[in-house]
Amino acid sequence: LSEEADDTDSELGSMKPLHTFCAMKADDGPCKAMIRSYFFNMYTHQCEEFIYGGCEGNENRFDTLEECKKTCIPGYEKTAVKAASGAERPDFCFLEEDPGLCRGYMKRYLYNNQTKQCERFVYGGCLGNRNNFETLDECKKICENPVHSPSPVNEVQMSDYVTDGNTVTDRSTVNNIVVPQSPKVPRRRDYRGRPWCLQPADSGLCKASERRFYYNSATGKCHRFNYTGCGGNNNNFTTRRRCLRSCKTGLIKNKSKGVVK
């Protein structure tokens, strides 16, 4: 219900959004799920990631970065079809330092857009944003000197996923706060699809029993599991067909052949 915002007086930029709801603040809602979502930030004029709680909130919320850009960035579809010239820094490289809500003490790296360099910072262990890397090398590779990659446009690479402070995979608890652990997933070169397809099945936090499907990256198949109705992760599909359509495309059979469609 709050128009949760930075406590600043900076006015919105002059760019007019395509829809009025694109001007709304990211609203995670009052529920406890942790669903990776995207919103259009009127201040930076970019689509950015946030964690949605699973209920209420507002219309400035999208399941994919692409959907957000198409909906809220004027002229995006026209520019998106032009071939990407050289390598570009992902949007999240420009996000501000965000240690997150938790009280852990983790040495991480972020790209500082002022100094144009990757720098060390202390991460609290949960939430935060994707400008958060486990190694200096990883940060440099993605944000300082990005190399052009043949992967599909706007598909998040595994490297984004492994270091993503927003993603809850195997859970451990510190001071009653969920802290993400490093997921046990295939190596980066083997999978170029959506990162959540590599997450383990997670039945969530509630008490319902709903039939869902998750993608098993080891077998390359979608399997059934019981979902409790809230929480969990994005490797969660209502039908086997949707699961396969979303996740199967990212599997790389052979390094020289690229993405299997």
């Epitope: 709050s2 128009e3 915002a5 009052p30 406890k32 209920c55 936090l205 809230c230």
Partner: antibody, heavy 117, light 107 residues
Framework: QVQLVESGGGLVQPGGSLRLSCAAS????????MSWVRQAPGKGLEWVSS????????YYADSVKGRFTISRDNSKNTLYLQMNSLRAEDTAVYYC??????????WGQGTLVTVSS | SYELTQPPSVSVSPGQTARITCSGD??????AHWYQQKPGQAPVVVIF???NRPSGIPERFSGSNSGNTATLTISGTQAMDEADYYC?????????FGGGTKLTVLG
């Protein structure tokens, strides 16, 4: 620092009207949702009404719907509660509170409204 | 309407642990927040989102939420903790409060 100061309370007869004000300082008022919460003498907290910052959405408890109106003047950093058709059961201390991500992080000290003949 | 149920009163000896519960059908899915209110004062948030403590709130205050019950725990309770405590959750655009629990510190 964040401060919320309510005013406008007092004694009013049943059926009468009153307008409460809440002067906010120490934060960017226009971007935050705000609420009114009341507490009858010796009773618990009861949510009355909320708005959504710079958007026009407003919300009311069933007990005040159609009688109370929440509004704000962002240029004056002030939240209002217009109370009409007042009843004895509206007697309470009325608090103004800032909404932050679905909880109330700052409260004013409250203003007492007494509805009695 | 949605109900959050709290015990009307809880008593504890100084230095002991006080536990105040709040039960509601939607608590497995929705966050609970806790407020402390001392006589003649405005409420103050002591726990938000089940288990997070705002800065300035002593470490002896902690919260948990499992099943249909959220719990506010005060370990090593002090005389200054004597107050009314309210739980709150948010549902369908509306904040809901529990009826409040009066915490009495004996002695």
């Amino acid at each position: 620092q964040v401060q919320l100061v309510e005013s406008g309370g007092g004694l009013v007869q049943p059926g009468g009207s009153l307008r409460l004000s809440c002067a906010a300082s120490g934060f960017t008022f226009r971007v935050y949702g705000m609420s009114w919460v009341r507490q009858a003498p010796g009773k618990g907290l009861e949510w009355v009404s909320s708005d959504r910052g710079s958007r026009s959405s407003t919300y009311y408890a069933d007990s005040v719907k159609g009688r109370f109106t929440i509004s704000r003047d962002n240029s004056k950093n002030t939240l209002y509660l217009q109370m009409n058709s007042l009843r004895a059961e509206d007697t309470a201390v009325y608090y103004c509170a800032r909404v932050y991500r679905y909880w109330f992080d700052y409260w004013g000290q409250g203003t007492l409204v007494t509805v009695s003949s | 309407s949605y109900e959050l149920t709290q015990p009307p009163s809880v008593s504890v000896s100084p230095g002991q642990t006080a536990r105040i519960t709040c039960s509601g059908d939607n608590l497995p899915k929705y966050y609970a927040h806790w407020y402390q209110q001392k006589p003649g004062q405005a409420p103050v948030v002591v726990i938000f989102r089940d288990s997070n403590r705002p800065s300035g709130i002593p470490e002896r205050f902690s919260g948990s939420n499992s099943g249909n019950t959220a719990t506010l725990t005060i370990s090593g309770t002090q005389a200054m903790d004597e107050a009314d405590y309210y739980c709150q959750s948010w549902l369908s655009g509306t904040p809901w409060f529990g009826g409040g629990t009066k915490l009495t510190v004996l002695g």
